[in-house]
């Protein structure tokens, strides 16, 4: 049968049952995923918008697939095996009374079973297994997978020791706290910082430690994945996003019509095929574009390149370069340059590096 061909799997709770507090639903689903991640190399991340691998839905009766629910009792839930689209999705019958305890139907226990299906497991003939086809309440505080459940899931994915870094051929969600993590582009958007990687972005809100991962397509469906450079002009509520030789303009978080446009409209020579990184400095009202080992400076008021560019990055940004992946401006005096898994806090008034950090240091890793 099918399996997920990646170890980082996203899930999203589409809607919430009124039977329980939202936090209790979140907790039950998170703990249910944890049951499976504890015995496999799989890692699960909750996303709040966009297309997740596994969508969790509460619904009654006919609800968008061939398998209409049957009212209270009978079928409690069903889940689709791994795959695109509806693949992996778990549907819970809203006509059941969902609970955190032994009354009604326990959401955690049902979710453990359904997520087993979402991961590719069929039913077990062992009555002690969570994958046994009939529901039976057990104490959730002492709940454990049976040997049969563990054997089944490890036959599909291996055991947790096999969690060595996999390449990322399918743009599965990168591990945020992987010390080797690098970013494609980074920019501020108001009081938030957007970190772009593959088809994902992380959102860091000012000083709060919490970050959330989202799909680029969930916020901006018309934009591509693999954004390569980004910068913000906060006074205009504008964000510019670059990929290959094109750029998109986002105003007030909405994509402007008639984009993408060619990067050559900024005045780049024809040999420039893509931008590695970009940053706007509101003090000088200039945008710095980094391309390979050089950079250009663009006057946002006059809408033209400043004369005398390009210049070498290493010559004018001491200790930075020769190439960079991403950069953003913060706190009125710093550029944060990203090179691979390393990040450099650069004071542009003193013109020197003031701190060396890991690229993911913003996430409390």
């Amino acid at each position: 049968g099918p399996v997920w061909r990646k170890h980082y799997i996203t899930y999203r709770i589409n809607n919430y049952t009124p039977d329980m507090n939202r936090e209790d639903v979140d907790y039950a689903i998170r703990k249910a995923f944890q049951v499976w991640s504890n015995v496999t190399p799989l890692k699960f991340s909750k996303i709040n918008t966009g297309m997740a691998d596994i969508l969790v839905v509460f619904a009654r009766g006919a609800h968008g697939d061939f398998h209409a629910f049957d009212g209270k009792g009978g079928i409690l839930a069903h889940a689709f095996g791994p795959g695109s689209g509806i693949g992996g999705d778990a549907h819970f019958d809203e006509d059941e009374f969902w609970t955190t305890h032994s009354g009604g139907t326990n959401l955690f226990l049902t979710a453990v079973h359904e997520i087993g299906h979402s991961l590719g497991l069929g039913h077990s003939s062992d009555p002690k297994a969570v994958m046994f086809p009939t529901y039976k309440y057990v104490d959730i505080n002492t709940f454990r997978l049976s040997a049969d459940d563990i054997r089944g899931i490890q036959s599909l994915y291996g055991d947790p020791k096999e969690n060595q870094r996999l390449p990322n051929p399918d743009n599965s969600e990168p591990a945020l706290c992987d010390p080797n993590l690098s970013f494609d582009a980074v920019t501020t958007v108001g009081n938030k910082i957007f970190f772009f990687k593959d088809r994902f972005f992380w959102l860091k809100v000012s000083e709060r430690p919490k970050t959330s991962v989202n799909l680029i397509s969930s916020l901006w469906p018309t934009l591509p994945s693999g954004i390569e450079a980004a910068y913000e002009i906060e006074a205009r509520n504008q964000v510019f996003l670059f990929k290959d030789d094109k750029y998109w303009l986002i105003s007030n978080l909405r994509p402007e019509p008639n984009y993408p446009k060619s990067i050559h409209s900024f005045g780049f020579p024809n040999f420039v095929k893509k931008i590695d990184a970009a940053v706007f400095n509101p003090r000088f009202y200039r945008t710095y574009f980094f391309v390979d080992n050089q950079y250009w400076r663009y006057d946002e008021r006059r809408q033209m390149m400043d004369p005398g560019y390009p210049k070498l990055i290493t010559k004018n940004f001491q200790g930075i370069g020769p190439k960079i992946d991403a950069v953003f401006y913060s706190k009125n005096k710093y550029y944060y340059f990203f090179q691979g898994s390393n990040q450099f806090e650069y004071d542009f008034l003193l013109q020197r590096i003031t701190k060396t950090l890991k690229s993911n240091s913003w996430f409390g890793c």
Epitope: G1, V57, G64, D65, F66, H78, G122
Partner: antibody, heavy 122, light 103 residues
């Protein structure tokens, strides 16, 4: 290469019967849900029936319930539609279509046959 | 029961035009919506699945969006081979179809 080839269509009188077949090749037939979809002349598509990987469960559109029976023979890689008590409004091109692999049908029809024409007329 | 309403039923456009077809469900179907293209005398072909995922081999000028009850299929720049009938579909329910004709 995935191929679905329907056969068994033809002219039949109202009240008559017909059995359509769909021969599958180029993929492992047994784990997939399979469906029949029809299209009356000059009209849109109408889903008719679907069947699970091992011959069950089966689903039917209300318009044909009790008259048509879907079945499959995994050893022959073949899907069938037994059509009884045929009516003029059953006149259509009948397509077989492949759904996803697994315990539940999604209705994501990624491969279709070319269709076979059934004409119900006196 | 779930019903799908597709609009418009027919549409005239020229090569190079941007075209949008909409499909509305009478209740939430999450992102469980597919789009098919059918040319005269041929079987339908899957274009977009799960509302916005492009089926392998389908040109990138086709895109889909939406979730819940409202969905759109967009062709960014019409090509001569795109003149056909388009259907939205969810499980056992198809929209009525949109015939795209040359202006």
């Amino acid at each position: 290469e995935v191929q679905l080839l329907e056969s068994g269509g033809g002219l039949v009188q109202p009240g008559g019967s017909l059995r359509l077949s769909c021969a599958a090749s180029g993929f492992t037939f047994s784990p997939y849900w399979m469906h029949w979809v029809r299209q009356a002349p000059g009209k849109g598509l109408e889903w008719v029936s679907g069947i699970g990987p091992s011959g069950g469960p089966t689903f039917y559109a209300d318009s044909i319930k009790g008259r048509f029976t879907i079945s499959r023979d995994n050893s022959k890689n073949t899907l069938y539609l037994q059509m009884n008590s045929l009516r003029a409004e059953d006149t259509a091109v009948y397509y077989c279509a492949r759904d996803i692999w697994g315990a539940y049908a999604s209705g994501l029809f990624d491969y279709w046959g070319r269709g076979t024409l059934v004409t119900v007329s006196s | 029961d779930i019903q799908m309403t597709q609009s418009p039923s027919s549409l005239s456009a020229s090569v190079g035009d941007r075209v949008t077809i909409t499909c509305r469900a009478n209740q939430s179907i999450y992102t469980y919506l597919n789009w098919y293209q059918q040319k005269p005398g041929k079987a339908p072909e899957l274009l977009i699945y799960a509302a916005s995922s492009l089926q392998s081999g389908v040109p990138s000028r086709f895109s889909g969006s939406g979730s819940g009850t409202d969905f759109t299929l967009t062709i960014s720049s019409l090509q001569p081979e795109d003149f056909a009938t388009y259907y939205c579909q969810q499980a056992g329910i198809f929209g009525q179809g949109t015939k795209l004709e040359i202006k």
